[in-house]
């Protein structure tokens, strides 16, 4: 970077090299060039020569003043115009940064995704700081009083094998950067209460021709948790409002849920589950699309497990008696 150049003098920033965004700052340049009484001192920001607010302080030093500096990062360097030198002479350079002190981390959440082998802790970091901000996650056993600390730039995955101090812990997060430090409230957790079941996935849908046509949604999870509560939400793709159905589920077999839907309408379905009575839910599953038939034929929509939900294409094949389409929309 700019800080690695050989200097013939000195460049410095007041109040500091890293400062609060929106501050007025002064950049000083002091030349120490052999056989040169600088006629002029020039400042450059990101390679562009600065024109305004440059004040000469004395024979060797000049000041560049910025009002309300808002750039997160800038490379500054300064040069001297020496008599009898055709080109400007480089004095020195410095990278400067502006940003904000961290907000108090809040909404600290720790969950164990089933089969992951990790406790994942996340938090709301607050407003963007623009500068390097580190987070220390403190995990303290309420049984042994032993405390462990984990340094990270965002969230943290802590191996459940390293949580040897029993089941109950206090978790809190400290945020720190060059402009300040803040600490979250403490979160009390019990490892058995924060497990989120293995993801529930909708595999297919079919509409059965009957007096009143009926749509069956097939869905499943690999969870070994016995008592699981789930929600399935659905709506016509043209609607804003979701309908929600609740289920107490036993995943020893594939779930089948029945819906009576309007004909010839494209619907979207999503499912999520939690261990019954616990705090945390899975995130909603990927959207699963199914269009109900106009009238008679049986329609099946399949989620191909190897496909990720991405495209906007409909794959359709017509065979005797029913229409099959995948879940990827139009």
């Amino acid at each position: 970077g700019i800080t690695n150049i050989n200097c013939s003098g000195h460049i410095w920033v007041e109040p500091a090299t890293i400062f609060k965004m929106g501050m007025n700052i002064s950049i000083y340049c002091q030349a120490a060039i052999k056989n040169c009484q600088p006629r002029k001192l020039h400042f450059y920001k990101n390679g562009i020569k600065e024109r305004f607010q440059i004040t000469r302080i004395n024979k060797t030093t000049a000041r560049l003043w910025y009002k309300n500096f808002l750039e997160p990062h800038a490379s500054m360097y300064c040069t001297a115009e020496c008599p009898k030198h055709f080109q400007e002479t480089l004095i020195c350079g410095k990278d400067i940064s502006s940003g904000y002190p961290p907000d108090i981390p809040d909404e600290v959440t720790c969950v164990i995704y089933e089969y992951s082998g990790n406790m994942t802790c996340t938090w709301n970091a607050g407003k963007l700081t623009y500068i390097d901000t580190k987070y220390v996650v403190h995990v303290k056993s309420l049984e042994t009083e032993e405390e462990q600390q984990y340094l990270t730039s965002s969230y943290i995955n802590i191996s459940t094998d390293s949580l040897q101090g029993g089941k109950k812990y206090l978790v809190w997060v400290q945020a720190a950067n060059a402009l300040g430090m803040e600490e979250s409230k403490q979160l009390q957790i019990h490892l058995d209460d924060i497990v989120i079941p293995s993801a529930a996935v909708i595999s297919r849908a079919e509409t059965i021709n009957a007096t009143v046509p009926k749509t069956i949604i097939y869905w499943d999870s690999q969870t070994t948790i016995e008592k699981v509560s789930c929600e399935m939400r659905y709506k016509a793709t043209t609607n804003q409002t979701w309908n929600v159905k609740e289920f107490d589920t036993n995943f020893t077999y594939v779930q089948q849920s029945e819906f009576y839907l309007e004909p010839n309408i494209k619907y979207v379905f999503q499912v999520r589950c939690q261990e019954t009575g616990k705090r945390y839910w899975q995130p909603w599953s990927s959207p699963f699309f199914h269009k109900t038939p106009e009238t008679v034929p049986q329609v099946t929509s399949k989620a191909f497990q190897h496909d990720t939900w991405n495209s906007g294409l409909t794959v359709a094949s017509i065979s005797t008696g029913h229409l099959t389409s995948d879940n990827r929309g139009d």
């Epitope: 600088p38 006629r39 562009i48 600065e50 024109r51 305004f52 440059i54 000469r56 115009e81």
Partner: antibody, heavy 119, light 107 residues
């Protein structure tokens, strides 16, 4: 050799607009700052507006007396400098010179164009 | 902005005279000073830059000196074509500023 030719001056009523041009040749236009310096009848020289070279990212400067009324611009493809003068006042009456600066002193000057603001 | 004060505002001299015009800056301008000559109805012409460097094509009877805040333009032997108005310009700090001018007239 360096040549600067101003045009666009004339008699104009107060409140009206005028656009001056300065056609430049004989030097690398991009690498030089360009200025408008005016001289009221019988008075001294005053920097009115300045548009800097590429190395300064073409930063512009205006004297307080013309801020928000005058606009300096340059067309590097045509080697031409402009001064758009709006809301003209009697005190804007002057000879307007186009000048070139590589350092910050004015090395070359045009012959000037007279602007008379009168009702 | 830096203020430039020129003196005298006018002077009368004869051909062959040694003429000195001074320019004082409101702060140290570190030899960033230029001198211009302007004849009636003509554009200014650069004579001297960096306080003492003679612009190409300018007769050697013109010279400049000075440092800090005080600067001098000297015409060693005044010629008929030198009767004109002379201006100093500081370009140490932006924006550059002119002195108010010194008119050199025939005595």
């Amino acid at each position: 050799q360096v040549q600067l030719v101003e045009s666009g001056g004339g008699v104009v009523q107060p409140g009206r607009s005028l656009r001056l041009s300065c056609a430049a040749s004989g030097f690398d236009f991009n690498s030089y700052g360009m200025s408008w310096v005016r001289q009221a009848p019988g008075k001294g020289l005053d920097l009115v507006a300045d548009i800097n070279s590429k190395s300064y990212n073409y930063a512009t400067y205006y004297a307080d007396s013309v801020k928000d009324r005058f606009t300096i611009s340059r067309d590097n493809s045509k080697n031409t400098l402009y001064l758009q003068m709006n809301s003209l006042r009697a005190e804007d009456t002057a000879v307007y010179y186009c000048a070139v600066h590589h350092s910050d002193y004015f090395e070359y000057w045009g012959q000037g164009t007279l602007v008379t603001v009168s009702s | 902005d830096i203020q430039m004060t020129q003196s005298p505002s006018s002077l009368s001299a004869s051909v062959g005279d040694r003429v000195t015009i001074t320019c004082r800056a409101s702060q140290d301008i570190y030899t960033n000073l230029a001198w211009y000559q302007q004849k009636p109805g003509k554009a200014p012409k650069l004579l001297i830059y960096h306080a003492s460097s003679l612009q190409e094509g300018v007769p050697s009877r013109f010279s400049g000196s000075g440092s800090g805040t005080d600067y001098t333009l000297t015409i060693s032997s005044l010629q008929p074509e030198d009767f004109a108005t002379y201006y100093c310009l500081q370009d140490s700090e932006y924006p550059p500023t002119f002195g108010q001018g010194t008119k050199v007239e025939i005595k």
